[in-house]
Interface confidence: low
Amino acid sequence: DGPAGSWEQLIQERRSHEVNPAAHLTGANSSLTGSGGPLLWETQLGLAFLRGLSYHDGALVVTKAGYYYIYSKVQLGGVGCPLGLASTITHGLYKRTPRYPEELELLVSQQSPCGRATSSSRVWWDSSFLGGVVHLEAGEKVVVRVLDERLVRLRDGTRSYFGAFMV
Amino acid sequence: DGPAGSWEQLIQERRSHEVNPAAHLTGANSSLTGSGGPLLWETQLGLAFLRGLSYHDGALVVTKAGYYYIYSKVQLGGVGCPLGLASTITHGLYKRTPRYPEELELLVSQQSPCGRATSSSRVWWDSSFLGGVVHLEAGEKVVVRVLDERLVRLRDGTRSYFGAFMV
Amino acid sequence: DGPAGSWEQLIQERRSHEVNPAAHLTGANSSLTGSGGPLLWETQLGLAFLRGLSYHDGALVVTKAGYYYIYSKVQLGGVGCPLGLASTITHGLYKRTPRYPEELELLVSQQSPCGRATSSSRVWWDSSFLGGVVHLEAGEKVVVRVLDERLVRLRDGTRSYFGAFMV
């Protein structure tokens, strides 16, 4: 393309560069639904923001296709290892795409944090962090799931969170 | 603004893009002060660098406002769980702003690594990683704190570190 | 340089910005060689991709000098703590440079995950995540090593992975 075209593209790129897509969503009291669905997140208050991405029912929704570094941290904690609780916690980032009914695992961690507690009444804490680069198309969604979510400990949005930015 | 203005901005953007703010600071023998203050960091030797950010008394100081991915890892370790040591380790990234006297929690993890050691003489190791996107204004500072810092194990800057880059 | 020169550079920068180097490599059955060498990775199938970086024998190879956020996660797991297995797992990112024969440690974590298992037949899981910004020259390589790699658990590329992007 000629200089004019290049110029338009450069201006466009500068404008889009100003809003390089990024988001950081924080844990809130409403995050844990107990429904088996994905975690829900705060999108506006405190440290939470959306810039060039949108949010729907726990999902970051991509508006501009590209490669994104996506990340999530969850704070886990409990007292001993109650019977009926899975000894393994699975924390994952999953993709939902309009073209396909199933969620796709993107980044996943398994941990056995309860095993740290050597007595049934001992308080324990653990943290799980995930981050990695994935390609996302416009309209695709990313969600966070934790199984068993009863061990997720929320407080103030600093201990459990979910975010992304285009790289 | 007209083409000339756009041109100037584009040139400016190219120049600033050349120094997209980034930093990686590494743990050193002087990192642990025992004073209750934030951890201190190496800024020049080895793998450490500052590019478009500055450093003061343990803090990364923002010179250009924007959204930053900030991160820190600390290497924890010990022998058994000595009495008097907290069973919970808190590792966090905190913001100091000129407009407000209190530090603000940004990203925090709690872990109970001692619980891994099944005997009082057992050596254990654990690692805590934090990372997330936050908005920072020029002049704001970010620090790392660990409570109880006596369990942080330093060696050569590869195991405990602190960094940021603009997204 | 004059406007023409600047223009050329801007056009060039726009083109290079379109392929801001990034990669995400995933764990595969062939990742664990049992050789003491670095882990090997899937570069094309599924979630894996290379964009402006290349791959050779487990290494991400830099083609464009700059600061890169490099990261890796490995999924660890086992049943109890078999004798002969190191009680400490070391997971690290290492640099190989054409100018120097020895590898340089960049980012390293030590963990004692076996200690979580309070009985010899208990299944345990743990995850180690590393990420940080390092400067890499063209031709330099980054590899992932895990000692003892017998505790790395592979499945489908979502639990153990390795990536980088220029910041």
């Epitope: - | - | 024998d57 024969p101 020895e102 440690e105």
Partner: antibody, heavy 117, light 107 residues
């Protein structure tokens, strides 16, 4: 410049132990590992094992497993190799070398250990 | 363990000769191979790593090639100071192993 300086020659009786030291200078000790290699009189080179000066992790050749212990002291930038239950065929020059995860770039001058009754 | 077989074990040559030493690995080791030179009473000295990369300070008459299971060290024009024993070493799999050595003697 990089230097590895080893302790002096030793004469030991069968069944005894020997400890050889290797003091490193001229580089950041904890960034790299130390390998130990031995060479019996008139023979080739034999790799004994490796220790990370950083993590203390070790990897010993099967042949020496249970008889050898490699350690490091990061405060003095010194690596140590202890070989126990010495036999006459352990008579050799013992070398420390910087590296082991990749190549053995710098070597100590060697320490002659003689095992004789 | 990976066995490395060097050939020949002994080699007689004259100053100015082109000398080639071969090292075979019992299984593929990609290019994880190094070559060392050792003179009597001295520690080995690194010549080449990653099969073909010349270590800093080593004369350019030394070169290495090969990948997988077969590797060669070539000295393009033998000099008086090159009379020594040469060892190959694989760096891919623990335990690290050395070839049996090739002694280059004056003819």
């Amino acid at each position: 410049q990089v230097q590895l300086v080893q302790s002096g020659a030793e004469v030991q009786k069968p069944g005894a132990s020997v400890m050889v030291s290797c003091k490193a200078s001229g580089y950041t000790f904890t960034y790299y590992g130390i390998s130990w290699v031995r060479q019996a009189p008139g023979q080739g080179l034999e790799w004994m094992g490796w220790i990370s000066a950083n993590s203390g992790n070790t990897n010993y050749a099967q042949k020496f497993q249970g008889r050898v212990t490699m350690t490091t002291d990061t405060s003095t930038n010194t690596a140590y190799m202890e070989l126990r239950s010495l036999r006459t065929d352990d008579t050799a020059v013992y070398y420390c070398a910087k590296g082991g995860v990749a190549v053995l770039e710098y070597w100590g001058q060697g320490t002659l250990v003689t095992v004789s009754s | 363990d990976i066995q490395l077989t060097q050939s020949p074990s002994f080699l007689s040559a004259s100053v100015g000769d082109r000398v080639t030493i071969t090292c075979w690995a019992s299984q593929g080791i990609s290019s994880y191979l190094a070559w060392y030179q050792q003179k009597p009473g001295k520690a080995p000295n690194l010549l080449i790593y990653v099969a073909s990369t010349l270590q800093s300070g080593v004369p350019s008459r030394f070169s290495g090639s090969g990948s997988g299971t077969e590797f060669t060290l070539t000295i393009s024009s033998l000099q008086p100071e090159d009379f020594a024993t040469y060892y190959c070493q694989q760096l891919k799999i623990y335990p690290l192993t050395f070839g049996g050595g090739t002694k280059v003697e004056i003819k």
